[in-house]
Each structure stands twice: as C-alpha cells, then as structure tokens.
C-alpha cells in the first residue's frame, strides 16, 4: 500500500465497511499540515477532508464515512496546492472487520461453544484462540460463522480464550487486516475466572492472514 512518491508512506484501513482511514508518514513534511483531498468517483471534483487525524499537532491522516461502498478511493495529499502523493485504491482490499461483540461461552463436559454476533456482511472467518497454563502456544479454531465449538478440553484445567474476525482472502484478497482481539476471558470447570494461574501474558495478535 505504501507509496514512495516524495518519501510519502500511506496506509489505508477500511474499518468494518463503514469508515476509511488513510494515514501518511512523510518525513520531508513532518512539520507541515498536509491536506487530504478525495473522491469516490472518477468524474467528481475532489472534496477536502473534514476529519483529520493529528500527530504532534500536524495532520497525519483522514477519516472518511464510506458505508458499505464497493468503490475506488481517489485521493491526493497536498502541501498547499502542490500534490505530494496521488493515488487510487479499491477500498475493500483493506477491510478490517470490527472486533467480536457479545462473546458468549456455552460449556458441555469437555467442549465449549463460543458464539458472538455475526457481522452484517459475509465472507469472514471467526477465529477462537485458547490455551491453558500447560500449553506452550495458543491453539486455534475458526469457522465462517461466529459459532465455534472446541472439543477435547480438560474440565480441570483453566483456559484463556479470545476471539477475532478475519476477512477471507479468497474473497477480499491478501491485503486485509484481522480485527482486534476480544478481551481475554478465563474459564475453569465451566465457570469464569479472573485469570488462569501461571498463564503468561497473551502474545500480541498475530498479523498473519
């Protein structure tokens, strides 16, 4: 995604098919308020951003409303009237689903079913990662609805769980982002726990697709 025009690096994230965030890192213009101009249609005039992101008091990005659009975003980052980076990108390639909401756990002997609210669009994978203090790494299971059953658990062990959503590469391509993880929740004997003893701090979310 990043461009190298005049040393400008860009990142696009399409949050949950609702909001597009374009951020830039332009070392040459680090103390400059660059402006962001955009359009969703090649025929239209450019609009200027009305919702800038700031870093150390200077513009570093723009947030745009783009509810359920399958469009190309045409944009120009400018220093005054001089374009320092101009590009066009298909927004949905950079989809980042929202984090799972209303995560619930239903236990039955040595199995747990993890459910959450399905997002309003499809072609997603709902991934549950879990581990006990005796596991060296996280185990993972995913399904294409938020209804994931994990079997073969030890009822006496305490398990930590978290959930995220990923866009299917077959549909959206390889450049999407996984959602943020849900909060970690800990369970033992079918009951929620504050923590699992001896559980190391959960690793940062893996950014692999």
């Amino acid at each position: 995604q990043g461009g190298a025009a005049e040393g400008v690096q860009i990142q696009i994230i399409y949050f949950n098919l609702e909001t597009v965030q374009v951020t830039w890192n332009a070392s040459k213009y680090s103390r400059t308020n660059l402006t962001f101009h955009y359009r969703f249609n090649g025929d239209e005039a450019y609009d200027q951003c009305t919702n800038y992101l700031l870093q150390e008091g200077h513009t570093s990005g723009c947030l745009l409303d783009a509810e359920q659009r399958d469009d190309i975003l045409y944009f120009s980052i400018r220093n005054g009237t001089h374009p320092v980076f101009t590009a066009s990108r298909w927004m949905v390639y950079y989809l980042k689903p929202s984090s799972p909401k209303h995560v619930r756990f239903s236990w039955h002997q040595d199995a747990v079913t993890v459910t959450c609210s399905d997002l309003s669009y499809g072609d997603l994978l709902y991934e549950v990662q879990y581990r006990s203090p005796f596991d060296t790494e996280w185990q993972s299971k995913q399904e294409n609805t938020c209804n994931v059953t994990i079997e073969g658990l030890d009822a006496e062990k305490c398990y930590s769980f978290w959930v995220r959503v990923k866009a299917m590469e077959d549909v959206y391509g390889p450049d999407t982002y996984p959602s943020d993880w849900s909060e970690v929740t800990c369970w033992q004997r079918g009951e929620i726990r504050d923590a699992c003893a001896e559980t190391p701090t959960p690793p940062k979310p893996k950014l692999s697709k």
Epitope: R69, D70, S88, Y121, D170
Partner: antibody, heavy 118, light 106 residues
Framework: QVQLQESGPGLVKPSETLSLTCAVS?????????WGWIRQPPGKGLEWIGR???????SYNPSLKRRVTISVDTSKNQFSLKLSSVTATDTAVYYC???????????WGQGTLVTVSS | EIVLTQSPATLSLSPGERATLSCRAS??????LAWYQQKPGQAPRLLIY???NRATGIPARFSGSGSGTDFTLTISSLEPEDFAVYYC????????FGGGTKVDIK
C-alpha cells in the same frame, strides 16, 4: 464445483436494453463472493463491466456506469446484467464469472454472444 | 484508467520451446496482476494471480514474475494444448485487461 451459465436474447435492437442472467450452480450466492460480468467483442480483447455482492452492493466500469445495472436474486441463485441504449459496439460475447481473491475471475461461464442489430 | 500493453502481439513457436510473454502497465499495479489463457470458442481460464501464484490445477510449466509495471508469463516448455491467446489483467484501480498475446505454432 461452482458452475455459471449465461442466458438471454442473442439479438437486441439498437437503442434497446440488453438483458442477461447468470445462473450459478454448485454454490449459494448468498454464502459469499462477488460476482461479475465481462464482455469480449468478436476478435477483440476483454472488458470488465461490473460486479455485485449478494447484499446488492455494486461496482461498475466507469466507462459503462451510466448504462449498466447489475442485480442479484439470491432466491433463484442468479445475478443479472442490464445494459441500456445499446449500439453496434456493444456486440460481444458476454461472460459471467465469480470474483476470486480480491478481483480475479474464476470460474467463468461459457459466454453468450449478443448481437446488436436492427 | 490503467492501460496494460502486451507484447508481442503474436509469438510463433514450436512445441517444447520456451515462451516468454510480456505485460507492461501504464502505472504501478504493485503485484495486482493475473494471467489468463483463452482457446477459440472458450472462456478464459485463470492461470496466475497476484503476479506469481499459480491457480489451482495449473501445471508447473506456467510461471509468472514481476511487480510494479513490468510482468512476465513464462511457459517453460510448450505443450500442444498451450497454443492459445494469453491476457493479463490488473486489479489495482478498477479492472482492465491487456490486448492479448497469441501463441501459435511455427
């Protein structure tokens, strides 16, 4: 496996509307993917027309946008193309295809020739 | 619109020879490029996607390379069934195809 089949009139008069349907078998459209239309004038190259998601969200080739409508009928597991105000330059083999991996086409229907002539 | 220019327009080769097809984009398309094969009276078939990944069921003699504006499809040793027209396609901004390269028997 997924199979697609185009159907519709093979002959359309100038200034009228071309209408085609793509029936999908082996996969439920409502389960996902984007679905697209491409055309190929006789002896020439390929031109993308547009695509649709099962929710009805569409995207069209800017050069055809004012004349194209793509719709989906999940109950019949099919999607359709309408191209208005046709001229002889719209004569082509029209293909439907599944969009895959972001925006590649695989698989394709076998194509249907539409001739625009009075 | 991103224009894809394919060369040569026609490539005349014999079975067993190596075929090298070129596709040049009018601006960078990163690795967002695919190759298709089309035989007379048939629909195109996806061969290579994202510049270098072979689609399911495509023989290893087909390979793709390149990024940015210059891309190559290589057929290491032509089989009789490989004589066809080959198209490149980009998905960076909208979707456009090249004009095609015809590989025919010398």
């Amino acid at each position: 496996q997924v199979q697609l089949q185009e159907s519709g009139p093979g002959l359309v008069k100038p200034s009228e509307t071309l209408s085609l349907t793509c029936a999908v078998s082996g996969y439920s459209i409502s389960s996902g993917y984007y679905w697209g239309w491409i055309r190929q004038p006789p002896g020439k190259g390929l031109e993308w027309i547009g695509r649709i998601y099962h929710s009805g969200t569409t995207s069209y080739n800017p050069s055809l946008k004012r004349r194209v409508t793509i719709s989906v009928d999940t109950s019949k597991n099919q999607f359709s193309l309408k191209l208005s105000s046709v001229t002889a330059t719209d004569t082509a083999v029209y293909y439907c295809a599944r969009n895959w991996g972001g925006n590649w086409f695989d698989p394709w229907g076998q194509g249907t020739l539409v001739t625009v002539s009075s | 619109e991103i224009v894809l220019t394919q060369s040569p327009a026609t490539l005349s080769l014999s079975p067993g020879e190596r075929a090298t097809l070129s596709c040049r984009a009018s601006q960078s398309v990163s690795s967002y490029l695919a190759w298709y094969q089309q035989k007379p009276g048939q629909a195109p078939r996806l061969l290579i996607y994202d510049a270098s990944n072979r689609a399911t069921g495509i023989p290893a003699r087909f390979s793709g390379s390149g990024s940015g504006t210059d891309f190559t499809l290589t057929i290491s040793s032509l089989e009789p069934e490989d004589f066809a027209v080959y198209y490149c396609q980009q998905r960076s901004t909208w979707l456009t195809f090249g004009g095609g390269t015809k590989v025919d028997i010398k």
